[in-house]
């Protein structure tokens, strides 16, 4: 019960976090800053990863995409693929857990297989997480660096004195969104890979067989093994017997047809 | 790169109408706000009249009821028409355009500006 708790709560966590990933992406609020500022209206300006906008206070707003700007930061680029590489493995991670959930059942797949599916979405979740937290990161970086390496200089360009102008640069929601998203993703990532474990298959039942040597009044009776899977332990040292095998409690056995092999 | 073409400057009597004209060409992702200063001899630059993409005018004390800034976006043009001028308004008016950069600081780019002689 306890692992299917894990494993759901790992999947409606995970879930969200994918969510609040690609609405981080498609966000236009990565940046803002203020553009322009008089007695009579200002000009606010917030960047996405895909086009920038500008709303002044008196209502107007405008947005445009980046489309045929050159001289972007790289960075952009880099930030791009890392938020579209988390969304992706995101995804897959997904519909790879839609199957491996305990409380639904497909055909008469095993214990085992669902455990490995388990285990895989875990890992995509994981990478998902730190895709999305390091694209973020990155963005906020590159923020920063830009503001400092902006300083207000003036130089004289083809079309006369060209002044880089300071305006105060803000992390928009977006940066905020994607970090906890990020590491909402990472945590169902994790809590996927403990329900891993509790979902492999925790033995294997062998046959025990009481072999009897002929004149003898007492049987040899082999212990039942259990094989382990390596994730749980046979703490209760119980032995496992099936078919026509004797019971423990017996003293003497007699032979019979089923007890030669 | 930003190059501003400013026209419209001259010499004009006191009481006449000056309208002046700068347009803004090159390679620049959007251009925010587009306005006029000027420089009077031995005095230092002051704001005339801006204009913001979305059609915001501010316009200072001293040309208030005087003057009109209009913008073309389409063209990348501002427009300043000055009326009922005075001595006092004779100045080099300089066009100024804030350019937004991307994940950078804006820029603020200005015309070589246009002489405006206000004489009898």
């Known amino acids: 019960m306890a692992v299917t708790a894990c494993q759901g709560l790992g999947f409606v966590v995970s879930l969200i976090g994918i969510a609040g990933i690609i609405a981080a992406t498609c966000m236009d609020q990565w940046s803002t800053q203020d553009l322009y500022n008089n007695p009579v209206t200002a000009v606010f300006n917030y960047q996405g990863l895909w086009r920038s906008c500008v709303r002044e206070s008196s209502g107007f707003t405008e947005c445009r995409g980046y489309f045929t700007l050159l001289g972007l930061p790289a960075m952009l680029q880099a930030v791009r693929a890392l938020m579209i590489v988390g969304i992706v493995l995101g995804a897959i991670g997904l519909l790879v857990s839609i199957f491996a959930l305990k409380c639904i059942r497909i055909g008469s797949m095993e214990d085992s297989a669902k455990a490995n599916m388990t285990l895989t979405s875990g890992i995509m979740f994981i990478v998902s997480g730190l895709c999305a937290i390091a694209g973020v990161s990155v963005f906020a970086n590159m923020l920063v660096t830009n503001f400092w390496m902006s300083t207000a200089n003036m130089y004289t360009g083809m079309g006369g004195m060209v002044q880089t102008v300071q305006t105060r640069y803000t992390f928009g929601a977006a940066l905020f969104v994607g970090w906890v998203a990020g590491g909402l993703t990472l945590i169902g990532g994790v809590m996927m890979c403990i329900a891993c474990r509790g979902l492999a298959p925790e033995e294997t039942n062998y046959k025990a067989v009481s072999y009897h040597a002929s004149g003898h009044s007492v049987a040899y009776k082999p212990g039942g093994f259990k094989a382990s899977t390596g994730f749980g332990s046979n703490t209760k040292n119980k032995k496992i017997y099936d078919g026509g095998a004797r019971t423990e409690d017996e003293v003497q056995s007699y032979p019979s047809k089923h007890d030669y092999v | 790169e930003v190059q501003l073409v400013e026209s419209g400057g001259g010499l004009v009597q006191p009481g006449g109408s000056l309208r002046l004209s700068c347009a803004a060409s090159?390679?620049?992702?959007?251009?925010?706000?587009m306005g006029w200063y000027r420089q009077a001899p031995g005095k230092g630059r002051e704001l005339v009249a801006t204009i913001t993409r979305g059609g915001s005018s501010y316009y200072a004390d001293s040309m208030k009821g005087r003057s009109t800034i209009s913008r073309d976006n389409a063209k990348n043009t501002v427009y300043l028409q000055m009326n009922s001028l005075k001595p006092e308004d004779t100045a080099v008016y300089y066009c100024?355009?804030?350019?937004?950069?991307?994940?950078?600081?804006?820029?603020?780019?200005w015309g070589q500006g246009t002489l405006v002689t206000v004489s009898s």
């Open positions: 090159g390679s620049f992702f959007r251009i925010v706000a």
């Open positions: 100024n355009v804030r350019v937004e950069v991307p994940f950078f600081q804006p820029n603020d780019y």
